[in-house]
C-alpha cells in the first residue's frame, strides 16, 4: 500500500525520495510520474534526472533538494485537489532487474479559510521507504534554458528552507535511504 | 512507418545456442524500451526480456534470466536475444516488440515484428 | 507473479453482436493493462493500453474499461474482421503476463 501524503490547495506539496550514490557524482538516473509505478520507467512522467542533471521536467514539479546528493524529493508547485492521486519514483539502479520504487499517495484538501496567510509553509512530512527509477533520454530533451515561469529566489529560499529545516534532517537520518554501491 | 524485422531463428539442436536479431526503423529506436516475446505453437503470448534505453537495465523471465541475454545496439538501430542451453521447450515465434517510450504514458507493446521461429530439436 | 485470467476461454458469435470479453488480474494492477488481437499466422496487434485507450488506427467500436483487477473489452458490432483471438497483459509488475487468450469464433 501506498504511504500517504498531505498537502493543501495553494501550498506546495513535497514527496521525499532519497537515495545515497555510490560516489560523489555517481548519480542514477530517476524518474517521477503520476500514476503508481509500472513495471518499468514512472507512468506519465512529470521529471526526471539522468547521471547528470535534471533533463526533463513539466510545470509545477521541479527537485527542491540536492539531487547530486541523492535528495530526489520532488516539490509540486501550487497544488489544486487534481494533483490528488498516487505518484512513482523509481531509481534505475544499473544491471538485471535492479530498479528500486515507491508508490506515494498525495491527498490534497481544501484550503482552510483563514484571515491572514502566514509565512509557514507546509511541506507534506513524512517519509516513505524507498523508490528508484532509470533512463536515457531522447536527443531532443528539455534544456534549463526551458524552465517554467518560476522566481529563482523564492527556489532559492525554498531550497534553504528545507535544507536547514529539522524535517530535512529528520528524513535524512531516518535510514529510509537506498545505498547504492 | 515503424518496422521490426526478425532473424536468426532455425532448427538447433537441444543445448545449443542462437542469436536472433531485431532490425528497427521509421522511429527513434533510442527513446523506446523494447522487448521480446515468444509464443510456443498453437499456444498462448508468453513475455521473454525487455531492455531499457540504453541498455544498462534489463529485465527477465525468471526462468530464463540464466540461459538468455536480451541487448541492444543503438547505433545499429537492432535488438538482440542471445540463447543459450536450448531445451525443446523453447520452441516457439519469437517476436520482438517496442514498449513503452521515454516519457512514460502509453504501457502496451505498440508494434510487433512478423516473428521468427526457433525450433529446438534433436 | 500477476495471474491474469481471461474468461471466457472462447466463445461464438454472429455479425453484428456484441461482445464482451472480460480480464482479471491477481493483484491491484491499477490501468496498466492492454489488450490486443491475433488472427492466425500472424502477429498480434495492440488494440487498447492503458485499460481504456485505443491505440492508432483502431476502430472505435472496439473499447475498453476497468482498473484495479477487473477488466473488459467490448466490441460494439461485430464485423467479419474480427474473429480472432483475444489477450489481455498487464504492465504492472515483472514479470509481464498475459491472459491465456479468448479465441471468437463465427456462430
Known amino acids: 500500500s501506498e504511504v500517504e501524503y498531505r498537502a493543501e490547495v495553494g501550498q506546495n506539496a513535497y514527496l521525499p525520495c532519497f537515495y545515497t550514490p555510490a560516489a560523489p557524482g555517481n548519480l542514477v538516473p530517476v524518474c517521477w510520474g503520476k500514476g503508481a509505478c509500472p513495471v518499468f520507467e514512472c507512468g506519465n512522467v512529470v521529471l526526471r534526472t539522468d547521471e547528470r542533471d535534471v533533463n526533463y521536467w513539466t510545470s509545477r514539479y521541479w527537485l527542491n533538494g540536492d539531487f547530486r546528493k541523492g535528495d530526489v524529493s520532488l516539490t509540486i508547485e501550487n497544488v489544486t485537489l487534481a494533483d490528488s492521486g498516487i505518484y512513482c519514483c523509481r531509481i534505475q539502479i544499473p544491471g538485471i532487474m535492479n530498479d528500486e520504487k515507491f508508490n506515494l499517495k498525495l491527498v490534497i484538501k481544501p484550503a482552510k479559510v483563514t484571515p491572514a496567510p502566514t509565512r509557514q509553509r507546509d511541506f507534506t512530512a513524512a517519509f516513505p521507504r524507498m523508490l528508484t527509477t532509470r533512463g536515457h533520454g531522447p536527443a531532443e530533451t528539455q534544456t534549463l534554458g526551458s524552465l517554467p515561469d518560476i522566481n529563482l529566489t523564492q527556489i532559492s529560499t525554498l531550497a534553504n528552507e528545507l535544507r536547514d529545516s529539522r524535517l530535512a534532517n529528520d528524513l535524512r537520518d531516518s535510514g529510509a535511504t537506498i545505498r547504492i554501491g | 512507418e515503424v518496422k521490426l524485422v526478425e532473424s536468426g531463428g532455425g532448427l538447433v539442436q537441444p543445448g545449443g545456442s542462437l542469436r536472433l536479431s531485431c532490425a528497427a526503423s521509421g522511429f527513434t529506436f533510442s527513446d523506446y524500451y523494447m522487448a521480446w516475446v515468444r509464443q510456443a505453437p498453437g499456444k498462448g503470448l508468453e513475455w521473454v526480456a525487455n531492455i531499457n534505453y540504453d541498455g544498462s537495465s534489463t529485465y527477465y523471465l525468471d526462468s530464463l534470466k540464466s540461459r538468455f541475454t536480451i541487448s541492444r545496439d543503438n547505433a545499429k538501430n537492432s535488438l538482440y536475444l542471445q540463447m543459450n542451453s536450448l531445451k525443446a521447450e523453447d520452441t516457439a515465434v519469437y517476436y520482438c516488440?517496442?514498449?513503452?517510450?521515454?516519457?512514460?504514458?502509453?504501457?502496451?507493446?505498440?508494434?510487433w515484428g512478423q516473428g521468427t521461429l526457433v525450433t529446438v530439436s534433436s | 507473479d500477476i495471474q491474469m485470467t481471461q474468461s471466457p476461454s472462447s466463445l461464438s458469435a454472429s455479425v453484428g453482436d456484441r461482445v464482451t470479453i472480460t480480464c482479471r488480474a491477481s493483484d491491484n494492477i491499477y490501468s496498466y493493462l492492454a489488450w490486443y488481437q491475433q488472427k492466425p499466422g500472424k502477429s498480434p496487434q495492440l488494440l487498447v493500453y492503458?485499460?481504456?485507450t485505443l491505440a492508432e488506427g483502431v476502430p472505435s467500436r472496439f473499447s475498453g474499461s476497468g482498473s484495479g483487477t477487473d477488466f473488459t473489452l467490448t466490441i460494439s458490432s461485430l464485423q467479419p474482421e474480427d474473429f480472432a483471438t483475444y489477450y489481455c497483459q498487464q504492465h504492472y509488475g515483472s514479470p509481464l503476463t498475459f491472459g491465456q487468450g479468448t479465441k471468437l469464433e463465427i456462430k
Open positions: 516488440a517496442r514498449d513503452v517510450g521515454y516519457y512514460g504514458g502509453n504501457y502496451g507493446f505498440a508494434y
Open positions: 492503458n485499460a481504456k
